[in-house]
Interface confidence: low
C-alpha cells in the first residue's frame, strides 16, 4: 500500500551549477495525498539550517508531483551553498536532503561557458 506520508524528493548530493546574474528556480518536489503541507526553504550554515524569510516562493502543480519553488531573481554570488526544504505535516517536520548551488560569479570568470558546455561540465561538484 502506498504511503500517504508527505515525501520530499530531493536526492542526496544533488546540485545545480548556475551563474550569478541569472534568474533561477530551485524546486522542491513534494508528494502528498490530501492536504498540501506547509513547506519552507532554509540555507545551511554549518550544522544549522537558517530559514529563508521574505523570499519569493511559489507552488507549481503537476500531475504526479507538486513543486515548492524558491526564486532567485537574480542569483547572487552569496547564494552559493546548500539548501533544504522542509514540510510541516501532522505536526511533524519532514526534511529533505540538501541540494547545493554552485554559483559562478561572471565578473570573475574569464569567459562564460555556453549552456550546453555548462550542462556537460558541472565541474564544481566532485572536483
Amino acid at each position: 500500500k502506498e504511503s500517504c506520508d508527505v515525501q520530499l524528493y530531493i536526492k542526496r548530493q544533488s546540485y545545480h551549477s548556475i551563474f550569478a546574474g541569472d534568474p533561477f528556480k530551485l524546486e522542491c518536489p513534494v508528494k502528498y495525498c490530501a492536504h498540501r503541507p506547509q513547506v519552507t526553504w532554509c540555507k545551511l550554515n554549518g550544522t544549522t539550517c537558517v530559514k529563508l524569510e521574505g523570499r519569493h516562493t511559489s507552488w507549481k502543480q503537476e500531475k504526479n508531483l507538486s513543486f515548492f519553488i524558491l526564486h532567485f531573481e537574480p542569483v547572487l554570488p552569496s547564494d552559493n551553498g546548500s539548501y533544504r526544504c522542509s514540510a510541516n505535516f501532522l505536526s511533524a517536520i519532514i526534511e529533505s536532503h540538501s541540494t547545493t548551488l554552485y554559483v559562478t560569479d561572471v565578473k570573475s570568470a574569464s569567459e562564460r561557458p555556453s549552456k550546453d558546455e555548462m550542462a556537460s561540465r558541472p565541474w564544481l561538484l566532485y572536483s
Epitope: Q7, E27, K63, L65, A119
Partner: antibody
Framework: QVQLQESGPGLVKPSETLSLTCTVS????????WSWIRQPPGKGLEWIGY???????NYNPSLKSRITISVDTSKNQFSLKLSSVTAADTAVYYC??????????????WGQGTLVTVSS | EIVMTQSPATLSLSPGERATLSCRAS???????LSWYQQKPGQAPRLLIY???TRATGIPARFSGSGSGTDFTLTISSLQPEDFAVYYC?????????FGGGTKVEIK
C-alpha cells in the same frame, strides 16, 4: 502502456560524440524524471544521469565531463550526448522512466536498449 | 559513491528450489532506497522489488525482498523456468545511483 524507444547510430568512431534519443509513447514526458543507463557487453549496469522534463539534470560524476542530457517536451523525447568516446563506451544504452515511491526512486519502464559500438 | 556487492556471482539451482540472493552496500542505504531487477538475455531489466520489500506491479508473490542498512536479500521461493536470469540490486540513497554486479541464476 508507456513505451520507450532508443534511436541513434550503432557505430561511433573514437573521439567522436555519441548521440542517442529516447522517444516516449503512450504517455507524457511531463511530470516524470527520465534516465539513461548503460551496460557494456557481458557486464553490469551503470547509471549515466537523469533529467526532469523541466530540464533539471544530474549526471554520474564518473562521466560528468562528457555528458549532456536534454529534453524536448514538444516531441516527447529526451536525448543523450557523450563526447570523446573510447572503446570503453561500447555498451547497450537504455533509457528508462523513474518511478517515485515512498522516499526512493526506481526505474519502472525501460527501452529495449540500443547497442553502440565505438570503433574506427 | 556507494558500492553494491552481490553474491554469489552465479547460483545453480533446479526448478522448484528456493533461491536466496544477497546484496551488500558499502554504507547504510536504509530500507527505502533498495531495488531489485531481473534481466533476461537480450532484454532490458525489469523492476521486481522497490523499497527493499515492495513488489512492483505484476510481479508474482514468489519474489520477496528483505533487509535494511547494508544487507539485503532477494528470495525466490520456488524457482520457475522463466526465473532463470540475472538479478541486479540498485541503491538510490546517494547520487550517483549504483547497481550491483549481478547474480546469475542458472539451471543446475
Amino acid at each position: 502502456q508507456v513505451q520507450l524507444q532508443e534511436s541513434g547510430p550503432g557505430l561511433v568512431k573514437p573521439s567522436e560524440t555519441l548521440s542517442l534519443t529516447c522517444t516516449v509513447s503512450g504517455g507524457s514526458i511531463s511530470s516524470y524524471y527520465w534516465s539513461w543507463i548503460r551496460q557494456p557487453p557481458g557486464k553490469g549496469l551503470e547509471w549515466i544521469g537523469y533529467i526532469y522534463y523541466s530540464g533539471s539534470t544530474n549526471y554520474n560524476p564518473s562521466l560528468k565531463s562528457r555528458i549532456t542530457i536534454s529534453v524536448d517536451t514538444s516531441k516527447n523525447q529526451f536525448s543523450l550526448k557523450l563526447s570523446s568516446v573510447t572503446a570503453a563506451d561500447t555498451a547497450v544504452y537504455y533509457c528508462a522512466r523513474v518511478i517515485l515511491y515512498s522516499s526512493g526512486w526506481s526505474f519502472d519502464y525501460w527501452g529495449q536498449g540500443t547497442l553502440v559500438t565505438v570503433s574506427s | 559513491e556507494i558500492v553494491m556487492t552481490q553474491s554469489p556471482a552465479t547460483l545453480s539451482l533446479s526448478p522448484g528450489e528456493r533461491a536466496t540472493l544477497s546484496c551488500r552496500a558499502s554504507q547504510s542505504v536504509s530500507s527505502s532506497y533498495l531495488s531489485w531487477y531481473q534481466q533476461k538475455p537480450g532484454q532490458a531489466p525489469r523492476l521486481l522489488i522497490y523499497g527493499a520489500s515492495t513488489r512492483a506491479t505484476g510481479i508474482p508473490a514468489r519474489f520477496s525482498g528483505s533487509g535494511s542498512g547494508t544487507d539485503f536479500t532477494l528470495t525466490i521461493s520456488s524457482l520457475q523456468p522463466e526465473d532463470f536470469a540475472v538479478y541486479y540490486c540498485q541503491q538510490d540513497y546517494n547520487l550517483p545511483l549504483t547497481f550491483g554486479g549481478g547474480t546469475k541464476v542458472e539451471i543446475k
